[in-house]
């Protein structure tokens, strides 16, 4: 083993370096000293370090480590934060457009129901927005409230426009009759199923993204232990005490130190992997009735169909409700007038397939692909940090924490550390409390994601009994029940091409193309064209 190079006789180099860390040179010895008070950079001979310098090095080493960790996670953090913002805004835009489409449908087809319908539609979509953002609202209650509110207006304005004002105090009775007589057929149930499934998935997707941000933020701001600070000081700064300013730590030694320092953080790895894979599974299932964009943008059509259903049954309904709500005190006897033959043949409920332009769904898949490139983020952290801090290539002529060596040997390094700080002890301490907390949160979200992810093949399951749908409710496949009625089947074209230009856009190069090409098909299925009308104005 070669003898160490002679220390700087005047500690001049050390002084000039330390000046950058700590202005004022009172702690730096003029010439090498025995250094018997040192606790980390234990000297083999005279040293240019003092106890105060050692403390400053430890502080700097821990700060360096925090900065390295933050820069390591910067790209991942940016990816999730931006996507969470993009999707949150995108979902809000979908809700606003769905509300506009529904209002337009009422205005074009049922002008006598506006402005009351606008009010009820507005309240419904406000609840939808709140639900997506985590509010404790029951989706079935939202849908029931919409139909409960609409029916009295439909009854008094469409079915019985000549009702005298004195008869208008029957609203409560009409609200009750709406459910008892199933006046909208199975449409409310259909909408409940679609909306609850799609919104649940949307909500959990946003929750998962926000938790991803929390995970990164937690590990990003970890405070490293004093033990770790000592190890880092020994690796990065103790060589300076011997005047070895240009020497770099051995790569193998860096890996050992980083694994020790990051033992707790690396424990997140297993749950992080599961998080990304579970999120991928959820995203893969987000289509048809599990895709809120698809469901909400087609909702106006289903509501239109439900009103047509009422109109087709107006004769029977008017008679029944006339008896039922003639006097509000008769309300408790509603069930006695329940007509057996009220329901229309379910075969009339035809399906309109939704033309679905790839926008939000392709954006989600793009996010998953990018996230998957970070699947080993936590297990790879020690190596990443070493590769982004100065280390000697090929482990030759490098610093092993005690001296300059020609080749790094982990065994030799361990032997040389016998009297010093023990790496094994550091690993045994277990993760920081904040890391344990974040692991618990990851476990919880992973469980939720697994619960929400549809098993393979479930999305197209033909057996709908568990949903309470009778065969024939809506074609053969509940997942295709997006609406559509007899004559002019209403088709919806996804209008969210603007997503590519959202203010938060991740990277312009990766944004989905904002293709403006309109084929004849585009014109046929423009969203606003057929909001209930079979004739399109732009032909």
């Amino acid at each position: 083993q070669p003898p160490p190079p002679p220390p700087d006789a005047t500690c001049h180099q050390v002084r000039s370096f330390f000046q950058r860390l700590q202005p004022g040179l009172k702690w730096v010895p003029e010439t090498p000293v025995p250094g018997s008070d040192l606790q980390v950079c234990l000297p083999k001979g005279p040293t240019c370090c003092s106890r105060k310098m050692e403390e400053k090095y430890q502080l700097t080493a821990r700060l360096n480590m925090e900065q390295l960790l933050q820069s390591a996670s910067m790209e991942l953090k940016f990816l999730i934060i931006q996507n969470a913002a993009v999707f949150q805004e995108a979902f809000e835009i979908v809700v606003r457009h769905a509300k506009n489409y529904t209002n337009a449908m009422f205005k074009n087809n049922y002008p006598s129901l506006t402005p009351q319908a606008f009010e009820f539609v507005g309240e419904f979509f406000t609840d939808v927005s709140l639900y997506i953002l985590g509010s404790d609202i029951n989706v079935d209650d939202m849908v029931n409230e919409l139909f409960d509110s609409l029916f009295p207006v439909i009854y008094t304005q469409l079915m019985n426009p000549g009702l005298p004002d004195s008869a208008l105090d029957i609203n409560e009775c009409l609200r009750g009759a709406r459910r008892d007589l199933k006046v909208f057929g199975n449409f409310p149930k259909l909408i409940m199923t679609q909306v609850s499934k799609s919104l649940q998935v949307t909500r959990i997707f946003l929750q998962a993204l926000n938790l991803g941000i929390e995970v990164i933020n937690t590990t990003d701001h970890l405070k490293f232990s004093k033990d770790c600070g000592r190890m880092l000081t020994r690796m990065w700064y103790c060589s300076y005490c011997q005047g070895l300013m240009m020497v770099k730590p051995c790569g193998g030694y860096c890996n050992v130190v980083m694994q020790g320092c990051m033992a707790g953080v690396v424990e997140i790895d297993k749950y992080w992997r599961e998080y990304i894979l579970s999120l991928e599974e959820l995203v893969n299932g987000m289509y048809r009735i599990y895709d809120m964009e698809n469901v909400l943008l087609g909702l106006f059509s289903t509501i239109h169909d439900s009103i047509q259903y009422v109109q087709k049954n107006a004769g029977k309904l008017t008679t029944t409700i006339g008896k039922l709500c003639a006097h509000s005190q008769q309300r408790q006897y509603r069930s006695a007038y329940y007509p057996e033959d009220l329901f229309i043949d379910k075969k009339v409920l035809k399906v309109a397939h939704v033309e679905h332009e790839e926008t939000l769904s392709s954006r989600r898949r793009e996010l998953i692909q990018k996230l998957k490139s970070f699947i080993s983020f936590y297990s790879a952290l020690p190596g990443y940090i070493c590769s982004h801090s100065p280390v000697a290539e090929n482990d030759t002529l490098c610093w092993n924490g005690q001296e300059l060596v020609e080749r790094y040997s982990q065994k030799a390094a361990r032997n040389g550390m016998k009297n010093q700080f023990n790496l094994h002890e550091l690993k045994m301490k277990g993760p920081e409390p904040v890391v344990s907390q974040i692991i618990d949160k990851l476990k919880h979200i992973n469980q939720l994601l697994r619960t929400m992810s549809m098993p393979k093949g479930r999305v197209l399951d033909k057996n709908l009994d568990e949903e309470g749908f009778e065969s024939g409710d809506c074609g053969d496949d509940e997942d295709e029940c997006i609406g559509g009625s007899g004559d002019g089947m209403i088709k919806v074209k996804n209008q969210l091409r603007f997503l590519a230009e959202l203010a938060y856009d991740l990277d312009v190069d990766d944004a989905p193309g904002n293709s403006q090409q309109a084929t004849p098909k585009d014109n046929e299925i423009s969203t606003f064209h057929n909001l209930g009308n079979v004739h399109s104005p732009l032909k």
Partner: antibody
Framework: QVQLQQWGAGLLKPSETLSLTCAVY????????WSWIRQPPGKGLEWIGE???????NYNPSLKSRVTISVDTSKNQFSLKLSSVTAADTAVYYC??????????WGQGTLVTVSS | SYVLTQPPSVSVAPGKTARITCGGD??????VHWYQQKPGQAPVLVVY???DRPSGIPERFSGSNSGNTATLTISRVEAGDEADYYC???????????FGGGTKLTVL
């Protein structure tokens, strides 16, 4: 293809009532709203109001007190009346088919001049 | 009431791309429609629902809408595109039609 043909008096004195009619040819009348829009010389478009086949109207608040839009479904026509006109009402008046939320087809326009 | 703001004029060389903006509070939440008006003629709908074209309108006309700005883009501009362009929204909260002030497109 739907066509909108409009006509009415082109020269009015202040305080008189502007009266225009628009006839709809070659398309459904009942499925849409029908609108009036005006454009003062060298200026932008201003929405006046709308009506549907059942007579349901909706007006621009700034003109509401002076505007009446009516419909005659038997003739597939709708009309605009604007009372107490002043020089500020000088404009080209357009009728249009309004398929909420846009105006898909327009009449040729009628220049109405208010001058004493 | 809802207000739409357009630049009074935009100039562009033939063959280049013209972009006409329409600003409004959270306009991205609304459907935006664009009309072209040539001197002495009635307006013609060129883009509806942010980005769709009626039949007969060239593919050179496209639209986008996000945040507080909607944009009408005319690529490979021709002399015949010189006209006034108006944006329009339906403000469903007031149930009124609202127009922007218009933008004069000059082809240099």
């Amino acid at each position: 293809q739907v066509q909108l043909q409009q006509w009415g008096a082109g020269l009015l004195k202040p305080s008189e009532t502007l009266s225009l009619t628009c006839a709809v040819y070659g398309g459904s009348f009942s499925g849409y709203y029908w609108s009036w829009i005006r454009q003062p010389p060298g200026k932008g478009l201003e929405w006046i109001g709308e009506i549907n086949h059942s007579g349901s109207t909706n007006y621009n608040p700034s003109l509401k007190s002076r505007v009446t839009i009516s419909v005659d479904t038997s003739k597939n026509q709708f009309s605009l009346k604007l009372s107490s006109v002043t020089a500020a009402d000088t404009a080209v008046y357009y009728c249009a088919r309004y398929y909420v939320p846009y105006l898909s087809d327009w009449g040729q326009g009628t220049l109405v001049t208010v001058s004493s | 009431s809802y207000v739409l703001t357009q630049p009074p004029s935009v100039s562009v060389a033939p063959g280049k791309t013209a972009r006409i903006t329409c600003g409004g509070d959270n306009i991205g939440y609304k459907g935006v429609h664009w009309y072209q008006q040539k001197p002495g003629q009635a307006p013609v709908l060129v883009v509806y629902d942010d980005s769709d074209r009626p039949s007969g309108i060239p593919e050179r006309f496209s639209g986008s809408n996000s945040g507080n700005t909607a944009t009408l883009t005319i690529s490979r501009v021709e002399a015949g595109d010189e006209a006034d362009y108006y944006c329009q929204v339906w403000d469903s909260s007031s149930d009124h039609v609202v127009f922007g002030g218009g933008t004069k497109l000059t082809v240099l």
